[in-house]
């Protein structure tokens, strides 16, 4: 049974041309992490892999860096950057974990974080 | 190259304990987790748990808790199998086997020990 | 508990000869089975993982198919070396062997 959880920073929104960090903490289980994978939608953006470091996707080379930690952080913004991402942790024996989290990139300077929530 | 070269063969008495290492060498030790396998003799390979390399906490399976202990020690990049009150049934080959793969789909144990033979007997 | 068995126990065969073994699972594993080769007195070798794909450096003519609860092991053509006996594993959740099949010289 797969007893861990996913944190995730949620619901977020940012200004265009800002930045922003996406950040994943699973917790509640001893299994062992091997790769974490971001993804856009269906679009691979970055691997945390164990023993090789970070990878970012070479067309996100210039507006994604690696970390803090397992998170991923976002610059140079624009208005696509809105939408799902996710975090998928790779983990034995329990297998995969995936967190959710909702970016808003918008226009005017009322960008607000929204609140942390679970995803069991 | 990537190997696990295990401790020699252990002659004991019941009631005794051993303790069986494991050390690896060719790769990052704390980025695969590590696993012990029996093989009684002219039985099938049985899985008795894993220990997460990071950190330190180890999993037993059913029928492996209490007598058995997993550890490490990450300096050297070796892991144990320690076993007490050892009895006759404790007789068989013990394998530590590394979990290769990075991705789910391709976890499998590629690496493993050449195998510790223990035998209990009086 | 996920248990695998595996069919037959013992296979006789010759050299040459086309040997298929198969492991079920007691429940669906997707495609997350590996299939190790034993000789006496050595080690398990890992021979197939993710039900198909060849561990690098294992012959060719070692296959494997499957998902979900029923999985092969296929050798097209067998060799001196290959007369072993092979266990079924898979790795999620809870570990676990299938009861291996030994395979002899006719």
């Known amino acids: 049974m797969m007893t861990g959880t996913i944190e995730t920073t949620g619901n977020i929104s940012a200004e265009k041309g800002g930045s922003i960090i996406l950040q994943c903490h699973l917790s509640s289980t001893t299994a062992q992490v091997t790769q974490v994978n971001w993804e856009q939608q269906d679009q691979l953006l970055a691997i945390c892999n164990a023993d090789l470091g970070w990878h970012i996707s070479p067309s996100f080379k210039d507006r994604v860096a690696p970390g803090p930690g397992l998170g991923l952080t976002l610059q140079s913004l624009t208005v696509n950057d809105t939408g799902e991402y996710f975090c998928i942790y790779h983990t034995y024996p329990d297998g995969t974990y995936t967190g959710r989290i909702f970016l808003e990139v918008l226009e005017s300077s009322v960008a607000e974080h929204g609140a942390r929530f679970q995803i069991p | 190259q990537v190997q696990l070269v295990q401790s020699g063969s252990e002659l004991k008495k019941p009631g005794a304990s051993v303790k069986v290492s494991c050390k690896a060498s060719?790769?990052?030790?704390?980025?695969?987790?590590m696993n012990w396998v029996r093989q009684a003799p002219g039985q099938g390979l049985e899985w008795m748990g894993w220990?997460?390399?990071?950190?330190?906490?180890?999993t037993y399976a059913q029928g492996f808790t209490g007598r058995f202990v997993f550890s490490l020690d990450t300096s050297v990049s070796t892991a144990y199998l320690q076993i007490s009150s050892l009895k006759a049934e404790d007789t068989a080959v013990y394998y530590c086997?590394?979990?290769?793969?990075?991705?789910?789909?391709?976890?499998?144990?590629?690496?493993w020990g050449q195998g510790t033979t223990v035998t209990v007997s009086s | 508990d996920i248990r695998l068995t595996q069919s037959p126990s013992f296979l006789s065969a010759s050299v040459g000869d086309r040997v298929t073994i198969t492991c079920r699972a007691s429940q669906g594993i997707s495609s997350y089975l590996a299939w190790y080769q034993q000789k006496p007195g050595k080690a398990p070798k890992l021979l197939i993982y993710?039900?198909?794909t060849l561990q690098s450096g294992v012959p060719s003519r070692f296959s494997g198919s499957g998902s979900g609860t029923e999985f092969t092991l296929t050798i097209s053509s067998l060799q001196p070396e290959d007369f072993a006996t092979y266990y079924c594993g898979q790795v999620m959740r809870y570990p676990a062997f299938g009861g291996g099949t030994k395979v002899e010289i006719k």
């Open positions: 086997a590394r979990v290769g793969g990075f991705t789910v789909p391709e976890y499998a144990f590629d690496i």
């Open positions: 993710a039900a198909s």
């Open positions: 220990i997460n390399t990071n950190t330190g906490n180890p």
């Open positions: 060719g790769y990052t030790f704390t980025s695969y987790p």
